[in-house]
């Protein structure tokens, strides 16, 4: 329950966050768990810790193994476990399935590549993007942000891409790759004002304080291959990545589905270890085309317990 | 040493209010949560909520919502309980502990509250 | 919600014996389960946290285990102080104590 994967190439540069969760104020010790000896904090080492975040600086194939970190608050100390794989560099352009995050889709007009687990560094755009490892060029390909856009989209354009970045800290810089496949569906159709389908408009979710919940914001904006269609969710009217709150996250991709030959599209917002302050926000999905913007408001309750004795 | 000081004993009449206090020393109440466990005599132990004292955020348990409220004071390091309309079966040692999100490490010695006509 | 189930109630063992008093929830709460002692007319205790993590200062005849639904506090050899009201509690899902085990003199 509190171990995470996490893998990445040697020479780039890998950062792996705590899978427990605690206040900003609890102090982060890392360990290597089969030694136990202590992870340094000091940013001149190779591999320290910094807080929640573990970074490798570059990575190695030895640093390959299983972390723990251990939060520790005044009164108890949570223990979280990271499990890292660093591999070498493919010779060729192959990129085995081990190193591949989840697979997205798009259509003939929306398509939207994430570059996964980019939010844990620190990054100034552009991105770079590969397809089958040759850059992507032409006026078809637009990195924009953390994603890769591609206009008038063909089934050709399904496979793998990688998205490419440079970390930097303390002002030296250091590569990151990852890479996820594509795949197209392709369809003709018209485009409608958004509807959201999920969720209902001022609609109430009861959580579990201390438990995780997933927010999904579902919309459908036509039938068929949609050249604008966009979900998100927005925090008291603010943006997730304005909001800085690292419990809270936008999953990496939009997953494209098709309902009844409708073309919809959802995001799903997770927040881990539910808090109380998260019952005071208001969350607010999202769905923008070309005909428009809807917004639909759901807040957090808490679920109301029966206990036995 | 953590240590958790209650307030005294307290007699109330049915439908009245008690409110506890919990001071806190060796320990930066901002730091953690303060949760109360209600013991009525020869009884199990029971939660009844917690405070994130920092932001003031509480939760409690079902069967106290709506007459429990419990409160903190960072610049005394001091938590409050404080039960309404109170009746027999409220009689009870209440205790103040602080901890995680999850459980209890430090207690306070206790507070009897006799409710009775 | 979680409803826990705490036997026995009542247990009588002499010194030295091995004791073992389990918790069983009606769902799988990984190891979000902590174990409390209390002697009369005082606070508890921690003994254990997350399952199987003994609070520092408390002997190590005290131990944990178990995952899921069925938990177990083992102490390995009785000892005159540990006579005393057991508690297991539960935070998975909010918070909430079983109903306890006195343990007594044989």
């Known amino acids: 329950k509190f171990s995470k994967q996490s893998w990445g190439l040697e020479n780039e540069a890998l950062i792996v966050r705590c899978p427990r969760q605690g206040k900003s104020s609890y102090i982060v010790d890392w360990y290597y768990s089969q030694t136990n000896k202590s992870i340094p904090t000091q940013e001149r080492n190779r591999v320290f810790a910094s807080g929640q975040l573990l970074k490798f600086l570059p990575a190695e194939v030895a640093d390959s193994g299983i972390y723990t970190c251990i939060v520790r608050s005044p009164t108890f100390n949570r223990t979280g476990y990271a499990n890292v794989t660093i591999y070498k560099k493919q010779p060729d352009c192959n990129v085995p399935d081990y190193l591949m995050y989840s697979t997205v889709s798009g259509s003939e007009k929306n398509s939207k590549i994430y570059c996964p687990t980019i939010d844990l560094y620190n990054w100034t755009a552009p991105l770079e993007w590969f397809k089958n490892c040759q850059a992507l060029q032409g006026s078809r390909y637009k990195a924009h942000k953390s994603f890769l856009v591609i206009d008038n989209v063909m089934t050709d354009d399904a496979g793998d891409y990688t998205c490419k970045f440079i970390h930097n800290e303390n002002g030296a810089n250091y590569s990151v790759t990852a890479t996820r496949s594509f795949t197209v569906k392709d369809e003709q159709g018209f485009s409608l004002f958004p509807v959201i389908r999920a969720p209902a408009h001022n609609e109430t979710k009861e959580v579990e304080i201390g438990e995780n919940t997933n927010l999904t914001c579902s919309a459908c904006f036509g039938k068929g291959a949609q050249f604008l269609a966009t979900v998100q969710w927005q925090l008291n009217g603010n943006k997730i990545t304005d909001f800085s709150e690292p419990r809270i996250q936008q999953e990496e991709g939009q997953n494209q589905s098709f309902s009844n030959g409708l073309a919809c599209v959802n995001t799903v917002l997770r927040i881990a270890d539910v808090k109380e302050e998260d019952l005071l926000l208001r969350y607010d999905c999202l769905a923008l085309n070309l005909h428009g913007l809807r917004r639909h408001t759901i807040r957090l309750s808490r679920k109301h317990h029966h206990h036995h004795h | 040493e953590v240590q958790l000081v209650q307030s005294g004993a307290e007699v109330k009449k049915p439908g009245a209010t008690v409110k506890i206090s919990c001071k806190v020393s060796?320990?930066?109440?901002?730091?953690?949560?303060m949760h109360w466990v209600q013991q009525a005599p020869g009884k199990g132990l029971e939660w009844m909520g917690r405070?994130?004292?920092?932001?003031?955020?509480?939760e409690y348990a079902e069967k106290f919502q709506g007459r429990v409220t419990i409160t903190a004071d960072t610049s005394t390091d001091t938590a409050y309980m404080e039960l309404s309309s109170l009746r027999s079966e409220d009689t009870a040692v209440y205790y103040c502990?602080?901890?995680?999100?999850?459980?209890?490490?430090?207690w306070g010695q206790g507070t009897l509250v006799t409710v009775s006509s | 919600d979680i409803q826990m189930t705490q036997s026995p109630s009542s247990l009588s063992a002499s010194v030295g014996d091995r004791v073992t008093i389990t918790c069983i929830t009606n769902t799988d709460i990984d190891d979000v389960i902590h174990w409390y002692q209390q002697k009369p007319g005082k606070a508890p205790k921690l003994l254990i946290y997350?399952?199987?993590t003994l609070r520092p200062g408390v002997p190590s005849r005290f131990s944990g285990s178990g995952s899921g639904t069925d938990f177990t506090l083992t102490i390995s050899s009785l000892q005159p102080e540990d006579f005393a009201t057991y508690y297991c509690l539960q935070s998975d899902n909010l918070l909430t104590f079983g109903q306890g085990t006195k343990l007594e003199i044989k």
């Open positions: 060796a320990f930066n109440i901002k730091d953690d949560y």
């Open positions: 405070i994130d004292p920092a932001i003031g955020n509480t």
């Open positions: 997350e399952g199987n």
């Open positions: 502990a602080t901890g995680d999100f999850y459980a209890m490490a430090y």
